[in-house]
Interface confidence: medium
């Protein structure tokens, strides 16, 4: 289109000089060179619309969005952000181009979004879109969901106070154990905050946003299930809400449920009951015990009793601060090259941990599984038989925990050799750590059986990259061996490897590699 103006969109990053910066055109800042945002005409748009490349800005950074318009005559303009109009004062540069600027000082989450610039020139009207986002997610949070009773209704609301606003979903399962795994067909997901169907076997609420996904299970005592060998334990921090569900099924309605804390009935307002008939006409009753904000004195044994079932208890422990309990002593493992093996860490923690496994500066996802005894376990099997140091790191809102593991792979040595003007060196990475022998090859010893003992220096050095041990042996050159072939051999319980070196001039001259099993 001949009539369309030539538009240039640029981003100017400012290095703040700790001065207070006004929105005038002469800000006391050091500016970086402008970055072209390549304003492109948006196809299939009603009206003339240009779109600038997306802009990512660090928190607290200051920037200017600038548009240069090569169009004759005067222009008027308006910036719009979050449906609100912002002042716009065009001016003209030395080349008589219209210049429109938007200064964003000390970028915050509230200033991120879409900035629209409406321009009217004598010839035409057009719109320019800038999308500005914050580069890092330091302002983002993902908090574990918690439950609240819905006002005047027998329903639970799931709340996660997170930024950005999370998607909340209920994860329901009506079968037992393994079949309640996340992707199992027995699992039903409901993307809503309020749940009315509270009779299911397993009820969890999950919240997810850009930072990931956090879930909270509705702690349940099922009077129809055989009690666990160890008493179930529930940890909470002071101020958090307590929710325990007691569930029982009986052939008819002639039974009742009650909650007691340390043999005292719970106060009115700290419990509510629901009942329903199941498909086989048996009666299901559930009784919730809840405290909207727990204090230290809410600690104790919560017992659910029924007139028709044996009672069951859970120990509720209220703590001031979260914790991670596990043994942090480092552990060393030695395995064969094809042996199946997993690292594992057993821990007790509250709130639930976030964890990673790290090897050679690379992080791997960490899965955790709850055990019946209140402990959890995290296993790592994806080591691909690479020897070295593996690190398990866990943290929650209040605590951090790190545990080191060393993995050694049993294998016969492999030898590498190099020589200089004054010495010859051999290196090996086998495990167990090999021992060394040096032999001289001569007319008298064509099979290289003449052992060299003088001038040999053995050491082990930690090869930092993988944390594994590398052994080395160095032979200092003497007149007696100059010009001869020498052989270095590394041996351990799994075998021997040798390398032959010609000792005449500087440089590595590995001649023959022998592999002797």
């Amino acid at each position: 289109n001949q009539d369309l103006p030539v538009i240039k969109c640029v981003l100017i990053n400012h290095k703040n000089n700790d001065s207070s910066v006004g929105k005038s055109s002469s800000y006391p800042m050091v500016s970086e060179s402008p970055e072209d945002l390549g304003c492109a005409l948006r196809p299939q748009s009603s009206g003339t619309v240009y779109e600038a490349a997306a802009v990512e800005v660090d928190v607290s950074a200051s920037i200017t969005l600038q548009v240069l318009v090569d169009a004759p005559g005067n222009i008027s303009c308006l910036w719009v952000f979050k449906h609100s109009s912002l002042n716009c004062q065009p001016h003209f540069d030395l080349q008589n181009r219209g210049v429109v600027s938007m200064v964003i000082l000390k970028m915050t989450e509230t200033q991120a979004g879409e900035y629209l610039l409406f321009i009217q020139s004598e010839a035409t009207n057009y719109t320019i879109l800038f999308t500005v986002s914050i580069r890092n997610t330091l302002l983002y949070t993902l908090r574990r969901p918690y439950f609240r009773k819905m006002e005047n209704q027998d329903a639970l609301v799931c709340i996660s106070e997170s930024v950005p606003e999370p998607i909340v979903e209920w994860v329901l399962c009506d079968s037992q154990g393994e079949s309640c795994k996340e992707e199992s067909p027995a699992v039903v997901k409901k993307e809503e905050k309020v749940l009315h169907e509270l009779f299911g076997t397993d009820i969890r609420c999950c919240a997810r946003n850009e930072l990931g996904r956090e879930c909270t299970r509705l702690f349940t005592i099922d009077l129809n299930q055989t009690p666990q060998t160890t008493l179930p334990q529930l940890f909470l921090k002071v101020g958090e809400p307590l929710w325990i569900r007691c569930k029982a099924v009986h052939v008819n309605h002639g039974f009742g449920l009650t909650w007691e804390l340390e043999n005292k009935a719970l106060e009115e307002g700290n419990y509510f009951e629901m009942s329903t008939y199941s498909t086989n006409r048996t009666m299901i009753r559930i009784l919730f015990a809840f405290v909207s904000s727990v204090a230290r004195n809410d600690t104790g044994y919560y017992t659910c009793s029924s007139s028709k079932h044996p009672s069951q208890s859970a120990l509720v422990t209220i703590v001031e601060k979260g914790f991670i309990n596990a043994t942090n002593s480092s552990e060393d493992y030695e395995i064969d090259q094809y042996e199946e093996f997993c690292f594992s860490v057993r821990f007790k923690a509250y709130p639930q941990i976030r964890c990673t496994w790290t090897f050679s500066r690379k992080s791997f996802p960490c899965e955790q599984k709850g055990l019946d005894n209140g402990y959890s376990i995290s296993k790592f099997c994806n080591h691909k038989h690479q020897p070295g140091e593996y690190i398990f790191h866990a943290e929650n809102d209040d605590a951090q925990f790190t545990k080191m593991f060393t993995l050694n792979i049993r294998r016969k040595p492999q030898v590498l050799a190099e020589a200089s003007a004054s010495q010859a060196s051999c290196f090996s990475d086998g495990y167990p750590l090999p021992s060394w022998t040096w032999k001289k090859c001569s007319d008298k010893s064509p099979n290289c059986t003449e052992e060299i003992t003088e001038g040999v220096w053995n050491r082990k050095a930690n090869r930092k990259v993988f944390g594994q041990w590398v052994s080395s042996s160095t032979l200092n050159m003497s007149e007696a061996i100059k010009g001869f072939l020498v052989k270095c051999c590394a041996y351990n319980s799994l075998g021997t490897s040798c390398e032959t070196i010609l000792l005449n001039s500087p440089g590595p001259f590995p001649f023959i590699q022998d592999n002797i099993s």
Epitope: R42, S45, S46, G47, V49, S76, C77, L78, V80, F81, K82, H83, S84, S85, L86, N87, C88, G113, E114, L116, F118, Q120, N125, T127, L129
Partner: antibody, heavy 121, light 108 residues
Framework: QVQLVQSGAEVKKPGSSVKVSCKAS????????ISWVRQAPGQGLEWMGG????????TYAQKFQGRVTITADESTRTAYMELSSLRSEDTAVYYC??????????????WGQGTLVTVSS | EIVLTQSPGTLSLSPGERATLSCRAS???????LAWYQQKPGQAPRLLIY???SRATGIPDRFSGSGSGTDFTLTISRLEPEDFAVYYC?????????FGQGTKVEIK
């Protein structure tokens, strides 16, 4: 000259949802802001949120966040406002209004005729 | 959010008289992005003034707006019979947009 024509009156039960449409005829549609404003019987005007259809840029008033969804279909030149979890106090006339950018403003210069939504059990 | 307070709540005047309506903002309204609307019973609002002082297309010159920052005024120099209605101010310079509660201009 732009005209905004809204869908007809609705009677809804508490807890349900309502979706009101606003169709633009004449003039440019996509690059102009469309606001939704409601007015309860005998009360003042209350801004609920707005959309700039061409970009899908949506802003909601805090009061309605999570309950209102504003969308637009450029191909049919129609904006929509859906309000969920209706309660009796949501009984009101719901207006759509188009912003004017002429003279570099942004105020709403064109209004729909209004849609009465009655929430009653 | 910016809260707009209009005064008086009701203004009782006769045709030919001058009407002065006030709109006060809890925070400064950026760049005078303040509008005035007129609404008659059973009708949609109609834009009178934008940018605090600019008259919208087709609005008679007896309507004028003034003010900046936090204090704004709508003046109707000589009331005509068709001017008796409810008047709302609205700020659109700071998210979210907000309206005043309205001033009713009624016949005395």
């Amino acid at each position: 000259q732009v005209q905004l024509v809204q869908s007809g009156a609705e009677v809804k039960k508490p807890g349900s949802s309502v979706k009101v449409s606003c169709k633009a005829s004449g003039g440019t549609f996509g690059s102009y802001g469309i606001s939704w404003v409601r007015q309860a019987p005998g009360q003042g005007l209350e801004w609920m949120g707005g959309i700039i259809p061409i970009f899908g840029t949506v802003t909601y008033a805090q009061k309605f966040q999570g309950r209102v969804t504003i969308t637009a279909d450029e191909s049919t030149r129609t904006a929509y406002m859906e309000l969920s979890s209706l309660r009796s106090e949501d009984t009101a006339v719901y207006y759509c209004a188009r912003d004017s950018w002429s003279g570099a403003t942004g105020a709403s210069d064109t209004w729909g005729q209004g849609t009465l939504v009655t929430v009653s059990s | 959010e910016i809260v707009l307070t209009q005064s008086p709540g009701t203004l009782s005047l006769s045709p030919g008289e001058r009407a002065t309506l006030s709109c006060r903002a809890s925070h400064s309204v950026s760049s005078s992005y303040l509008a005035w609307y007129q609404q008659k019973p059973g009708q949609a609002p109609r834009l009178l003034i934008y940018g605090a002082s600019s008259r919208a297309t087709g609005i008679p010159d007896r309507f004028s707006g003034s003010g900046s920052g936090t204090d704004f005024t709508l003046t109707i120099s000589r009331l005509e019979p068709e001017d008796f209605a409810v008047y709302y101010c609205q700020q659109y310079g700071s998210p979210p947009r907000t309206f005043g509660q309205g001033t009713k201009v009624e016949i005395k």
